[in-house]
């Protein structure tokens, strides 16, 4: 092909090539042709004769103002036609007359202000019709019943002001899963407008200034329809009462989106008419008081999003939002509750009472004063089968004994990004008999004891990053009870002292993060009592991160037991010479990171075993000594390996001898070196 199109598997991509005409030299068997973002003004039907196999044609983002009816004659198998972002203004009955197999027609962002006659009457197989971002002033798309297989009609961002039954009755035989009317200026729903449609399952009216009154009328018009999903996001619904959604009593609505409404007052029994509702989106509102009966009737809701729904009006404490006790008691089927980013004063004793199916609860950044978790804090969740609890970003400073004793089903507890500073006696976790993960990273300080985790032997993941960990060198180890642990993160704690039994018995450990500590002394031969082999016995360890610890020595047998190690990160240390057989047992190693150390020599006797099955190597920014003895083997290996070595050309540079300083390692000439073959 003389054009710069890329062709792969019968798909031709000719986008962004400044083309002014359709290429005539593409393979004739292509089924998908992408001509977007070019300078095409027309699509001569003759140019498509050779591409009769096309099922998808995308000519979006051009300057096409007219379509030849013969185009589809040449493309009998065409199913998807995308004409978005062009300059079409008129559609005649002939325009798509031969496009009888279309399932998708995209006409968004053109200049179509009116649909005359019946341009879509022949599209009996059409499933999606996108006319959004045009200048349409009505929903009138024809004068006779048509589009019987249409499922998605997208009319957002037009100038539609009224919905009329006589305009929508062309869909009398259609089952619309999605009628998208967002971002219009609708002010009227004429009687029977939705009944004109055969079946309407989804209606989207986001960014339409409905307000409480028009919303109520809308719902009355939706009565006795098949509506399942209703989206009214950003529709200026500032208040709801027990009549707002009355019309929906005669529907089986399962999804309702009321997000971004600045909703202030949720009156009692506002949703009493929605017993079938399952998914309820209320995020980004401004509810000042949730009454005990505000959510009454929502017996089937499984998912409720209240993110940023309760925000304070001013700095005055009196203006904090209120949630009455028992407000959620009606939600017997609720499984997922998101209450992130709110300004709720605290947790009352019956705040969550009645949520007998709740499995996921996010309370991240939810409270203005939740400094201490007591044994009463979560009493209202005692009968909830909660599996995941997120308490991040709440400025929690203390966890008292039995704080979670009500949560016997809990599997994941996230307490990260708080201000917890205390000795962990272990009583904090009492009752967490099924706990799988505790995330405590990014807190003030944690002092461990031998019993810190004595009551949670089921724990598999423990995250203790940047918590100013104290007493980690006690014996027995605080981690001794955690025989099921697979992930342990102790990074960023400036740990300088640990014992060789710190990880003893953790035979299931797979991931160990110890980066950004101060462990260098432990591996020095001059260490009193010799090096400390704190990695011994970790036979199932897969990932080991020891970055930024100041290591300048590695004892020869330190990785001896790590037979399953796949990834090791020793970057940003001060390593110069490594012992000959240090990696001998790492037969499964896939990734090795030694960047930013002081390595001058990469010899086979040290690195040969580690490099054997490597898929990724990072040794950037080391001061390589470009001599035969130091790097000949490495250079030959580099030039023959399939291992991924990022930035090999730019960041693997010789430091010595002086005449090679700054010279790329991979270009070092090994031809004069003896015995440097990388593979035997």
């Amino acid at each position: 092909s003389t054009t710069k199109c890329t062709v792969s598997h019968e798909v031709a991509d000719c986008s962004h090539l400044k083309l002014t005409q359709v290429p005539d030299d593409l393979p004739t068997n292509i089924t998908v042709l992408n001509l977007t973002h070019n300078q095409l003004r027309r699509l001569p039907a003759a140019n498509f004769t050779r591409y009769s196999q096309l099922t998808s044609l995308d000519v979006g983002f051009n300057t096409i103002s007219k379509l030849e009816p013969e185009l589809c004659q040449k493309l009998p198998m065409l199913k998807v036609l995308n004409l978005q972002h062009n300059e079409l203004s008129q559609l005649s009955d002939k325009t798509f007359a031969f496009c009888t197999n279309l399932t998708e027609l995209h006409l968004m962002s053109n200049s179509i202000q009116k649909i005359k006659n019946n341009p879509f009457v022949k599209q009996k197989n059409l499933i999606t019709l996108d006319l959004s971002h045009n200048g349409l002033s009505s929903t009138k798309l024809g004068t006779q019943v048509q589009l019987e297989n249409l499922q998605e009609l997208l009319l957002s961002n037009n100038k539609i002001q009224a919905l009329k039954s006589e305009e929508l009755d062309i869909f009398a035989n259609s089952s619309l899963k999605k009628l998208e009317l967002s971002s219009n200026q609708i002010k009227e729903f004429s009687p029977g407008c939705f009944h004109a449609i055969g079946r309407l399952f989804g209606l989207f009216l986001n960014n339409v200034q409905l307000g409480p009154s028009l919303t109520e009328k809308l719902c009355l018009e939706l009565a006795n329809t098949s509506i399942r999903n209703l989206s009214l996001s950003n529709s200026q619904l500032s208040t709801t009462s027990n009549t707002t959604f009355l019309g929906l009593k005669w529907t089986n609505l399962t999804m309702l989106d009321l997000s971004y409404n600045n909703l202030n007052v949720v009156g009692n029994d506002s949703f009493a008419w929605l017993p079938q509702l399952e998914y309820f989106f209320l995020e980004y509102n401004n509810i000042q008081h949730l009454f005990s009966h505000s959510l009454h009737g929502l017996f089937n809701v499984r998912y409720l999003n209240l993110k940023r729904s309760f925000t304070k009006q001013s700095i005055s404490l009196a203006s904090l939002p209120k949630i009455d006790d028992f407000s959620f008691q009606w939600l017997k089927c609720l499984e997922h509750l998101n209450m992130e980013d709110n300004d709720i004063p605290g947790i009352k004793s019956n705040m969550f009472t009645g949520l007998i199916n709740l499995k996921y609860l996010s309370l991240s950044n939810s409270f203005t004063s939740l400094r201490t978790l007591t044994n009463e804090t979560f009493v209202s969740l005692a009968h909830s089968p909660l599996h995941i609890l997120n308490l991040t970003k709440n400025k929690i400073s203390k966890i008292e004994s039995d704080a979670f004793s009500w949560l016997g089903h809990l599997e994941v507890l996230d307490l990260g990004l708080n201000e917890i500073g205390q000795e962990l006696t272990g009583q904090e976790w009492r009752g967490l008999e099924n706990i799988f993960e505790i995330y405590l990273s990014y807190n003030k300080y944690l002092q461990l004891t031998r019993n810190s985790f004595a009551l949670v032997p089921s724990l598999q993941r423990l995250m203790l990053r940047r918590v100013a960990l104290k007493n980690v060198d006690s014996s027995p180890s605080p981690f001794q009870p955690l025989r099921n642990l697979t992930i342990l993160d102790l990074s960023n704690n400036n740990i300088a002292n640990i014992n060789d039994d710190m990880l003893e018995g953790l035979e299931k450990l797979e991931i160990l993060d110890l980066q950004h500590n101060n462990l260098a002394r432990l591996w020095k031969h001059a260490n009193p009592g010799g090096p400390i082999y704190f990695l011994k016995g970790l036979s199932h360890l897969h990932i080991l991160n020891l970055e930024s610890n100041g290591f300048d020595e590695i004892p020869v047998e330190v990785f001896k037991d790590l037979f399953e190690l796949k990834i090791i990160d020793l970057g940003l240390n001060n390593l110069n010479t490594l012992p000959a057989s240090v990696f001998n047992n790492q037969v499964s190693l896939k990734s090795l990171n030694l960047q930013k150390n002081l390595i001058t020599s990469v010899e086979k006797k040290v690195f040969g075993p580690a490099f054997r099955n490597l898929t990724e190597l990072d040794m950037r920014f080391n001061p390589f000594d470009c001599t035969c003895e130091s790097i000949a083997w490495f250079v030959n290996w580099i030039n023959e390996t399939h291992t991924n070595i990022p930035e090999l050309s730019s960041h693997y540079l010789c430091n010595t001898p002086p005449h090679y300083h700054g010279f790329p390692v991979r270009l070092f000439d090994t031809s004069s070196c003896k015995d440097s073959a990388p593979f035997e």
């Epitope: 272990g426 004891t449 009551l455 032997p457 014996s475 001794q480 025989r483 003893e504 016995g537």
Partner: antibody, heavy 119, light 107 residues
């Protein structure tokens, strides 16, 4: 199943030493600390100390620190407790014990070794 | 060191009786308290740990309660095989001291 089998009864003279053994089976010896507890005739139980069979690290009860030595031989999965400078009030049954999944109780005990100190 | 004080030191009761033994710690041991049963010539047997959790195979007539410094072992309906000596022991910090024992005898 986990078993702790102790050595037989001993009779010792005051001032002598005694070494009691505790052979473990049914689990990996090096992964659980071994504790020693004694009981004088007609008296209560007294915790003496604990040893990590993996590295030999020990936490003693201060009361016994100067006279007790706890050791282990991992090759034969055996822990030892040696008490020196024996006195008559050291006459007791000496037990070894081990924690379980919960490290806050002793589900496993040896059968006990009676040490009699008599001139 | 934390001292453990058990009471009473001995107790006479009949089969079917409800019996309560108490144990007081000289400092806060949270809930790290275990109860053991010992019969003459035998090693102690674990009954309860973490103040209230029943050890494997222990009949439900045994129960434990308490937290901090005051703890209780209750036998709801004494059976003939329950006559023995009972000890509490803390597991908060070394040394793991025992109570002096409570001898439960047939009345």
């Amino acid at each position: 199943q986990v078993q702790l089998v102790q050595s037989g009864a001993e009779v010792k003279k005051p001032g002598a030493s005694v070494k009691v053994s505790c052979k473990a089976s049914g689990y990996t010896f090096t992964t659980y600390w071994i504790h020693w507890v004694r009981q004088a005739p007609g008296q209560g139980l007294e915790w003496m100390g604990e040893i990590n069979p993996n590295n030999g690290r020990i936490n003693y009860n201060e009361k016994f620190k100067t006279r007790v030595t706890m050791t282990r031989d991992t090759s034969i999965s055996t822990a030892y407790m040696e008490l020196s400078r024996l006195r008559s009030d050291d006459t007791a049954v000496y037990y070894c014990a081990r924690v379980g999944v919960m490290i806050t109780t002793f589900p496993y005990w040896g059968q006990g070794t009676l040490v009699t100190v008599s001139s | 060191d934390i001292q453990m004080t058990q009471s009473p030191s001995s107790l006479s009761a009949s089969v079917g009786d409800r019996v309560t033994i108490t144990c007081r710690a000289s400092g806060n041991i949270h809930n790290y308290l275990a109860w053991f049963q010992q019969k003459p010539g035998k090693a102690p047997k674990s009954l309860i740990y973490n103040a209230k959790t029943l050890a494997d195979g222990v009949p439900s007539r045994f129960s434990g309660s308490g937290s901090g410094t005051d703890f209780t072992l209750t036998i709801s309906s004494l059976q003939p095989e329950d006559f023995a000596t009972y000890y509490c022991q803390h597991f908060w910090s070394t040394p793991f001291t025992f109570g002096q024992g409570t001898k439960l005898e047939i009345k």
